[in-house]
């Protein structure tokens, strides 16, 4: 019988008695930075090459006995999860192991850095196919470790790391907090976040997705045919490293940005019980459980987008928060969110030659988040068109006036502290989908893009009575690029995209009362690329 | 995910470039920063990663490391260069007393210094 974790990541069309999806990652090399491993275990024999790299601190305590099986336990299990014959995800992947953790599972930032440098030098000396680096370890936030990961990622290496087992915000740990790394949290057979003793999986905006990480059967270093159950975000990260190896083997030219977008796209959505997470982290934590794509080819036609949350701005009056997309991604829209509702909106602005999303806190506000919608749009030419506050009763409006440019997102930003408290709502004139409409005292920013075959449409969902949440989703074949609230609703806390759904959040209705401004309208901009679809059909 | 200027403990030692007769003083107005792990039990004081500015060559890294050793020796401190980084980040790993941090932060090409810390299997 197939172990639960392999069943969970396998799409139904692969599910037979045996887990044998096509091509087991044979074109990919996976580097494992962990403990020593038992390379002659029957699960991984001939699949894992033990490098001569070793950089570990001495074991703590005078009573510590160096037992080979204990020393190899963690690394052997993970190597088995990635590429094991019986219980592995990518059975064809070849692996190389570097020892950066001692027999107690402890290492140093410096030892890990030297290990990453070793991988980069190996890559330069003998370039091979796609590389995946698995970092099943965590320490406190480290600027230097994150910087090293960034450099390696920019050299074309896919890094996958454990979110951490501290039941805490993953952004407080490294390498989990490095934006370029794919950070993985752990879920169990019930798709619940994993509890480990008094702690459990980390969470928050620095987690990219979750994967099976509890009661995972894999190679045991106790003997060459032994198996054991282990748990943790390391096991979850190993699943994603295996999935990444499978995807890269099928499409070796995939960039890190493309791989991350695909991992997110093919994940199971909204299956995790968010009540396990602290209340303030629920909105920031992705409700995604990793899975293999249903077919290894043909995903290229899709317009892929993901949501990136900024760090919290902090409560000072002029505080801002910035959300950034990866270098290969386009920022197609920008929104903001504040739990107190006190914010001064958001705007897209250029920074270092790239657009970023900046949200502004308001006086008395507890702080804001900026939310970027980051998409893969080849040959795109995007720009931001801004209209200053109109001061006219009809409100501020801006549209995409360049030929061939389509509207992908709307943002609004205002200087006044309490926008629209006593102002009537402003409604968009019908039949003008290519423009953004905002409050008369706000400046409005339209994200306008030109890309081959790109088409977009606006979809709205309005609710006349006050409601804590209003949503509008894009239909099958269309991808959500923009999410905002129609102006005039002063009690709106903000808007953000969850997968293909635009969510507009309002204050607790009990405190607002049902007035004319109780009406809340969520506005989604849904796009698709005919060019990508055609290119995909030509390939097939 | 976390920006580089995000949530972690940063100890900024804003130091001017009046170091004793440095041939290559840092550019005016720039100050190197010192970082350490916010989780105290995970700190490993006595070992530091000295990260140099992005375009620094290996030869400059080695020269900077030697300079630190020489200046430390003049003050009666023993230091050991454990590793010189190149390929990913320019810099070096040094075993030294925390007393020398002010001195190290004034060295040419230094971007920031981070105290070593523990990582754990997850």
């Amino acid at each position: 019988s197939i172990p639960w974790n392999l069943e969970r990541i396998t799409p139904p069309r692969y599910r037979a008695d045996e887990y044998q999806p096509p091509d087991g990652g044979s074109l990919v090399e996976v580097y494992l930075l962990d403990t020593s491993i038992q390379s002659d275990h029957r699960e991984i024999e001939g699949r894992v090459m033990v490098t001569d790299f070793e950089n570990v601190p001495e074991e703590d305590g005078t009573r510590f006995h160096r037992q080979a099986s204990k020393c190899d336990s963690h690394g052997t299990h993970l190597a088995g999860v990635v590429s094991g014959r019986d219980a592995g995800v990518a059975k064809g992947a070849s692996m190389r192991s570097l020892r950066v953790l001692n027999c107690q599972g402890k290492g140093t930032v410096s030892g890990t850095l030297i290990g990453l440098e070793f991988i980069r030098k190996s890559q330069l000396v003998q370039p091979v196919g796609p590389l995946v680096v698995l970092l099943p370890l965590a320490g406190g936030y480290s600027r230097v470790l994150n910087a090293a990961c960034q450099r390696l990622a920019r050299a074309g290496v896919v890094l996958v790391t454990a979110a951490g087992n501290f039941r805490d915000d993953a952004c407080l740990y490294s390498p989990a907090s490095a934006p370029e790394v794919i950070t993985v949290g752990a879920t169990n057979a019930q798709d619940q976040p994993v509890t480990l003793g008094t702690l459990g999986t980390n969470f928050g905006r620095c987690v990219d997705l979750f994967a099976p990480g509890e009661d995972i059967i894999g190679a045991s270093s106790d003997c060459s045919t032994c198996f054991v159950s282990q748990s943790g975000t390391s096991q979850a990260a190993a699943h994603v490293a295996g999935i990444a190896a499978m995807m890269l083997s099928a499409e070796p030219e995939l960039t890190l940005a493309e791989l991350r977008q695909r991992l997110i796209h093919f994940s199971a959505k909204d299956v995790i019980n968010e009540a396990w997470f602290p209340e303030d982290q629920r909105v920031l934590t992705p409700n995604l459980v990793a899975a293999l794509p249903p077919s290894t080819h043909g995903a290229g036609w899709q317009l892929f987008c993901r949501t990136v949350w900024s760090a919290h701005s902090g409560p000072t009056r002029m505080a801002t928060a910035v959300a950034r997309c990866a270098p290969d991604e386009e920022l197609l829209s920008c929104s903001s969110f504040s739990r107190s509702g006190k914010r001064r909106g958001e705007r897209m602005e250029a920074q270092g030659g790239k657009l970023v999303c900046r949200a502004h806190n308001a006086f008395g506000g507890e702080g804001v988040y900026a939310i970027a919608r980051c998409c893969l749009l080849p040959q795109a030419n995007c720009s931001v068109h801004t209209a200053p506050p109109a001061e006219a009763s009809m409100g501020t409006r801006v549209h995409c006036h360049q030929q061939g440019h389509v509207l992908t997102g709307c943002s609004s930003h205002w200087e006044v502290e309490d926008l629209g408290t006593h102002k009537p709502p402003v409604l968009r004139p019908r039949g003008q989908p290519n423009q953004c409409v905002g409050h008369r005292e706000a400046s409005i920013h339209a994200s306008c893009c030109h890309a081959p075959g790109l088409e977009c449409k606006v979809k709205e969902h309005g609710i006349p009575a006050p409601q804590e949440q209003v949503t509008v989703a894009c239909e099958e074949g269309w991808t959500l690029t923009g999410c905002s609230a129609l102006p005039g609703t002063s009690h709106v806390l903000g808007a953000y995209a969850v997968d293909n759904t635009c969510v507009v959040r309002s204050r607790d209705v009990s405190t607002t009362g049902s007035t004319s401004e109780g009406a809340v309208t969520a506005v989604a901009i849904c796009c698709r690329s005919r060019h990508l679809a055609q290119a995909s059909q030509e390939l097939q | 995910q976390e920006d580089e200027d995000g949530d972690y403990e940063e100890l900024v030692l804003a130091l001017r470039s009046e170091e004793d007769g440095l041939a290559e003083a840092p550019e005016h107005g720039t100050t190197a920063t010192f970082h350490r792990c916010a989780k105290d039990p995970w700190r490993l004081p006595g070992t530091y990663v000295v990260v140099l500015k992005e375009e620094t060559h290996l030869s400059q890294s080695e020269r900077t490391a030697r300079r630190l050793q020489a200046q430390a020796a003049r003050r009666g401190y023993l230091t050991k260069i454990l590793h010189v980084f190149h390929g990913l980040l320019p810099g070096f790993l040094v075993k030294m007393s925390g007393d020398l941090l002010e001195l190290a932060l004034k060295l040419p090409h230094v971007d920031y210094i981070e105290e070593d810390s523990s990582v754990f299997a997850q």
Epitope: S1, P3, D60, S69, K70, S73, H74, D86, A87, Q104, G105, K106, N165, L196, G197, E214, D215, I216, I217, S220, D222, C223, T225, C226, F227, V228, S229, Q230, S231, G232, S234 | S118, F120, A121, Q122
Partner: antibody, heavy 130, light 107 residues
């Protein structure tokens, strides 16, 4: 689905010996600790012994120490209980059960998280009588 | 050795009732407690582990609580299929002990 099938029970005289076997299916057998649990007629459950995945650690209830030996053969996916010096009070239905548990790492140490005995055999009856 | 004491030994109840069974440990076992259900002539079945975690496939009317030395198993609304004997088991160390059992019968 993991299945456990016990065999080897029967009637034996006091002082005699018996060897119980438990056959398991799937690689999951070697992944967990395994236990023997017994139930005397009309009585409650009594844990007898358990054994680690690789057989390197074994534990017994006081009343059987020195008389019973638990062992396992990973190649054959089998668990055994060798019972010597049998007494009348050893009369019971003997179940083999999987001890589902998992290891996870703390900061510099391994921890064990135990879920309980989640898969049981149908039981084999041992009667000790003259 | 740690002793486990269940109460009551026998419990009579009707379909739809809410019932509670208690298990007391002779010393603290943190949350390392499991509950099992056994029907005549059958092997036991795991219901709850780590004092309060519901085993996969077990109906949500079963719940567990407690830590240290006092634990309870609650069935929120008795169904005909729930009449059986229930056992608690401690696993504070690698050697385990069961409670003497609580027989739940139809009133």
């Amino acid at each position: 689905e993991v299945q456990l099938v016990e065999s080897g029970g029967g009637l034996v005289q006091p002082g005699g010996s018996l060897r119980l076997s438990c056959a398991a299916s799937g690689i999951t057998f070697s992944s967990y600790w395994m236990s023997w649990v017994r139930q005397a007629p009309g009585k409650g459950l009594e844990w007898v012994a358990n054994i680690k995945q690789d057989g390197s650690e074994k534990y017994y209830v006081d009343s059987v120490k020195g008389r019973f030996t638990i062992s396992r053969d990973i190649a054959k996916n089998s668990l055994y209980l060798q019972m010597n010096s049998l007494r009348a009070e050893d009369t019971a239905v003997y179940y083999c059960a999987r001890d589902r548990g998992t290891y996870y790492t703390g900061m510099g140490e391994y921890n064990y998280y135990y879920y309980g005995m989640d898969v049981w055999g149908q039981g084999t009856t041992v009667t000790v009588s003259s | 050795d740690i002793q486990m004491t269940q109460s009551p030994s026998t419990l009579s109840a009707s379909v739809g009732d809410r019932v509670t069974i208690t298990c007391r440990a002779s010393q603290s076992i943190s949350s390392w407690l499991a509950w099992y259900q056994q029907k005549p002539g059958k092997a036991p079945k795991l219901l709850i582990y780590k004092a309060s975690s519901l085993e996969s496939g077990v109906p949500s009317r079963f719940s567990g609580s407690g830590s240290g030395t006092e634990f309870t198993l609650t069935i929120s609304s008795l169904q005909p299929d729930d009449f059986a004997t229930y056992y608690c088991q401690q696993y504070n160390s690698y050697s385990y002990t069961f409670g003497q059992g609580t027989k739940l019968e139809i009133k």
